[in-house]
Interface confidence: medium
Amino acid sequence: MKVLQEPTCVSDYMSISTCEWKMNGPTNCSTELRLLYQLVFLLSEAHTCIPENNGGAGCVCHLLMDDVVSADNYTLDLWAGQQLLWKGSFKPSEHVKPRAPGNLTVHTNVSDTLLLTWSNPYPPDNYLYNHLTYAVNIWSENDPADFRIYNVTYLEPSLRIAASTLKSGISYRARVRAWAQCYNTTWSEWSPSTKWHNSYREPFEQH
């Protein structure tokens, strides 16, 4: 049994880091493998992660960390029984993938303005809480070409757009994702999408 693709890990910088790797053949990850991880810190505790299958030869492990600071570094040991298959390290602050925003809501009752709001996925005491910026994706269910991205570079989790920038009388969907420049993170996953029917009063034409 050998590791074909070494573990790569990302952290949500809150409580979970996710590591994925591939074995050289079909593997029952949860029964055959264990990923041990330990903060590189005197008197720290060692922890064991039981991996799950992620495709035939792929494995994924969700490492509970419960707390993360920028200086943290973890040792990772991948074991198959008594055999050490791979040894590495992982610094969560250098591999951050933020949690996805939630509770995306489209408010259509503000005159002819659409107000999109969502929730910051982090609690106020987390470092990322005040460092997230967002991308909002809006698309038409009827027209695949009607697809747009709005970059929200301020901290408030909301976006206002004129309803008239979208076509009237058709349904749209929106979703939002986050990233943090301070840790050069990857983008989060997209939030679940929300749907609304766009309608607004056409202005009278002037003759």
Partner: antibody, heavy 118, light 111 residues
Framework: EVQLVESGGGLVQPKGSLKLSCAAS????????MNWVRQAPGKGLEWVAR??????????YYADSVKDRFTISRDDSASMFYLQMNNLKTEDTAMYFC?????????WGQGTSVTVSS | DIVLTQSPASLVVSLGQRATISCRAS??????????MHWYQQKPGQPPKLLIY???NVQSGVPARFSGSGSGTDFTLNIHPVEEEDVATYYC?????????FGSGTKLEIK
């Protein structure tokens, strides 16, 4: 919200016994080493005992002043943590705090008072 | 055992001024890139509260007027500007090795 609540303190005679309990909530208890720290009236802080996690074989450590008299234990399924104190001495009179430990002792309970007196 | 010597034992500071508390360890508490020194605040009738961990990191929720510095054997806690609510006893603590020890405490009062 992390919470640690101690109980079991009280008045006991010298050479008597007492068992302190600490109920933990709001965090993954089984991931943390836990400590007991005490503070005699009007005095400073003294580390008493420490217990590690299951992955670390529930290893235990004690201050010399309590070794062979105190026993630290934990029940991860109930998120409980204990200090069995035997052969108590008057100098064990103190407020006893249960404390979570990661990089430092980051969360403390309110404490339970132990008085050893005849 | 590592002995932590804290000074001064008590400190009287005017509102808005700087309070500086020192802690000296009998041997180095720094290794592998970490300094295993921490600072706690204790108010009467309350448990200690972690202010600074690993010498210089401010614990979440602690005001920015608290700062820590140092490495090896010499460490400092600074409070600036001092506020009324900072009246308390401050302890340094190491977890470089067992047994863990604490400094004897510094009582901060406002002039």
């Amino acid at each position: 919200e992390v919470q640690l609540v101690e109980s079991g303190g009280g008045l006991v005679q010298p050479k008597g016994s007492l068992k302190l309990s600490c109920a933990a909530s709001g965090f993954s208890f089984n991931m943390y080493a836990m400590n007991w720290v005490r503070q005699a009236p009007g005095k400073g802080l003294e580390w008493v005992a420490r217990i590690r996690t299951k992955s670390n074989h529930y290893s235990t450590y004690y201050a010399d002043s309590v070794k062979d008299r105190f026993t630290i234990s934990r029940d991860d399924s109930a998120s409980m943590f204990y200090l069995q104190m035997n052969n108590l001495k008057t100098e064990d009179t103190a407020m006893y705090f249960c404390v979570r430990h990661l990089r430092a002792m980051d969360y403390w309970g309110q404490g339970t008072s132990v008085t050893v007196s005849s | 055992d590592i002995v932590l010597t804290q000074s001064p034992a008590s400190l009287v500071v005017s509102l808005g001024q700087r309070a500086t508390i020192s802690c000296r360890a009998s041997q180095s508490v720094s290794t592998s890139g970490y300094s295993y020194m921490h600072w706690y605040q204790q108010k009467p009738g309350q448990p200690p509260k972690l202010l600074i961990y690993l010498a210089s990191n401010v614990q979440s929720g602690v005001p920015a007027r608290f700062s820590g510095s140092g490495s090896g054997t010499d460490f400092t806690l600074n409070i600036h500007p001092v506020e009324e609510e900072d009246v308390a006893t401050y302890y340094c603590h190491h977890n470089r090795d067992l047994p863990f020890t604490f400094g004897s405490g510094t009582k901060l009062e406002i002039k």
